[in-house]
């Protein structure tokens, strides 16, 4: 048993049929010594008396809010949550496996630049009685500060018969050094509590590996005289690290016809303009990627040819 | 060329070669996210590689103030990786494919380090750790880790030289 926060405790249980469970001793937080009784949740049934209560925790029915009283007055509470371990593996019932970039990916994180700010998100089908708490650090043996906000519900989607809820959190490394080569990964830890079930999820990454620039901005076309060619120009996204002479991007320019089956013409360039042939009913799209490190491409910015 | 005394390197040449290094490093090990190499007990293997850290002055302000701190660190890293790529980690079994970019990568690391420090000048270099894995599979894993680490190192070096070429070239 360990303390998650004040008056909230997590009991770690090996979860299999007829498992013996864990013996837990609860102590009433009071100077009183006599006349103390214990109850569980809303029930008025007295479970025991005295300053301590010993219980055998085997299943969710044994978890909940234990309260010690004296003469009708509440003295203190202890909320017991369960963390299940099945076949040596901690349960992951609360969050959905996103399966990207690999199986058992519950948390996904992205950064728009090298400032040390990043966003993580996760999915669940659970709609009520759900809380999340997020902690993060750079490294684990001598952890350096990363400050995370509160997790918030950021999207709701219908997936077949199910509703899916996306939660996200923003974090900022306190002493981020954008120009340095990271040697210690960022660690993100999410505590999830659904009713009386506790689970924790972790992710470890370098900012450089989760970089995904915003799409290029101000995408414009300028027809060239007496030609089917156009000059496409764009700018670095506002959210990208500066100066651009140091934090450089490379770009992919694509000409795509109306039909998905039509051949795509692609040009790669380090410049912020390119000359392409604009076909009727086609569209021109541009996306960006870090010039020197192959992290994710941005989403496409697009304009019609006409 | 960057001489320990403090003259400027050939920023544009260094820029071109460092960008080529980035391309080669990724073609030598393009599998981003394919293996989570940090799960494989990194500490005893690639923790000793030189990293370009915050205090090395490789940020735009540091380069403007005195690029020598940064150039010395980059030089140290280039020599280190050049030795690693020439060691039995890469020359031993399993043999690299004949068209593997590792050979070109090795030569380009040497080329850039010579651009930064001509013959006759000496910056201190970092000791190369004695990593001689006995099993071919260990060697393969170590190659992947070294190449992943090299990708991060050369990305910072390439940014430094691109910025230098754009803002510090005479």
């Amino acid at each position: 048993i360990w303390e998650l926060k004040k008056d909230v405790y997590v009991v770690e249980l090996d979860w299999y049929p007829d498992a013996p469970g864990e013996m837990v001793v609860l102590t009433c937080d009071t100077p009183e010594e006599d006349g103390i009784t214990w109850t569980l949740d809303q029930s008025s049934e007295v479970l025991g008396s005295g300053k301590t209560l010993t219980i055998q925790v085997k299943e969710f029915g044994d978890a909940g809010q234990y309260t010690c009283h004296k003469g009708g007055e509440v003295l203190s509470h202890s909320l017991l949550l369960l963390h299940k371990k099945e076949d040596g593996i901690w349960s992951t019932d609360i969050l959905k496996d996103q399966k990207e970039p690999k199986n058992k990916t519950f948390l996904r994180c992205e950064a728009k630049n090298y400032s040390g700010r990043f966003t993580c998100w996760w999915l669940t089908t659970i709609s009520t009685d759900l809380t999340f708490s997020v902690k993060s650090s750079r490294g684990s043996s001598d952890p350096q500060g990363v400050t995370c906000g509160a997790a918030t519900l950021s999207a709701e989607r219908v997936r077949g018969d199910n509703k899916e809820y996306e939660y996200s959190v923003e974090c900022q490394e306190d002493s981020a050094c954008p120009a340095a080569e990271e040697s210690l990964p960022i660690e993100v830890m999410v505590d999830a509590v659904h009713k009386l079930k506790y689970e924790n999820y972790t992710s470890s990454f370098f900012i450089r590996d989760i970089i995904k620039p915003d799409p290029p901005k101000n995408l414009q076309l300028k027809p060239l005289k007496n030609s089917r060619q156009v000059e496409v120009s764009w700018e670095y996204p506002d959210t990208w690290s500066t100066p651009h002479s140091y934090f450089s991007l490379t770009f992919c320019v694509q000409v795509q016809g109306k039909s998905k089956r039509e051949k795509k013409d692609r040009v790669f360039t380090d410049k912020t303009s390119a000359t392409v042939i604009c076909r009727k009913n086609a569209s021109i799209s541009v996306r960006a990627q870090d010039r020197y490190y192959s992290s994710s491409w941005s989403e496409w910015a697009s304009v019609p040819c006409s | 060329r960057a001489v320990p005394g403090g003259s400027s390197p050939a920023w544009t040449q260094c820029q071109q070669l460092s960008q080529k290094l980035c391309t080669l490093a990724w073609s030598a090990h393009p599998l981003v996210g394919h293996m989570d190499l940090r799960e494989e007990g990194d500490e005893e293997t690639t923790n000793d590689v030189p990293h370009i850290q915050c205090g090395d002055g490789c940020d735009p302000q540091g380069l403007r103030d005195n690029s020598q701190f940064c150039l010395q660190r980059i030089h140290q890293g280039l020599i280190f990786y050049e030795k690693l790529l020439g060691s039995d980690i890469f020359t031993g079994e399993p043999s690299l494919l004949p068209d593997s970019p590792v050979g070109q990568l090795h030569a380009s690391l040497l080329g850039l380090s010579q651009l930064l420090q001509p013959e006759g000048h000496h910056w201190e270099t970092q000791q190369i750790p004695s990593l001689s894995p006995s099993q071919p599979w260990q060697r393969l894993l170590l190659r992947f880790k070294i190449l992943r680490s090299l990708q991060a190192f050369v990305a910072v070096a390439a940014r430094v030289f691109a910025h230098g070429a754009a803002t510090l070239s005479p």
């Epitope: 350096q144 306190d174 340095a180 | 850290q53 205090g55 540091g62 701190f69």
Partner: nanobody
Framework: EVQLVESGGGSVQAGGSLRLSCVAS????????LGWFRQAPGKEREFVAA????????NYADSVKGRFTVSRDNIKNTVYLQMNSLKPEDTAVYYC?????????????????WGQGTQVTVSS
């Protein structure tokens, strides 16, 4: 060649104040994390305070919290340790150190360069 030179040590009565300074040369000061450590006779060197490269993170040992303040001046390449309400148990040689990582690290192993130290004696 990297040099860190501490000054400002001396003898003081309990309850008094001292301000230690450490001037750095031969390194890129702005990007280094800077720390203060101390060593009393017959004891191990221990962490006192540290400040990150950008000043955004500062760490103190529990024993000095609320009494000591660490600060840095990137123009003068100097890190300071303001010590107030000094106690006899603060008596030690105080060392300043720099960390290339840029972090306000509490770990002695994170520091690359060290000064020679300055003696602080607090009498009751």
């Amino acid at each position: 060649e990297v040099q860190l030179v501490e000054s400002g040590g001396g003898s003081v009565q309990a309850g008094g104040s001292l301000r230690l300074s450490c001037v750095a040369s031969g390194l890129y000061f702005n990007g280094n994390g800077l720390g203060w450590f101390r060593q009393a006779p017959g004891k191990e060197r221990e962490f006192v305070a540290a400040i990150a490269w950008n000043g955004a993170r500062i760490n103190y040992a529990d024993s000095v919290k609320g009494r000591f303040t660490v600060s840095r001046d990137n123009i003068k390449n100097t890190v300071y340790l303001q010590m107030n309400s000094l106690k006899p148990e603060d008596t030690a040689v105080y060392y300043c150190a720099s960390a290339r990582s840029g972090y306000a690290s509490i770990s002695i192993n994170e520091y690359d360069y060290w000064g020679q130290g300055t003696q602080v004696t607090v009498s009751s």
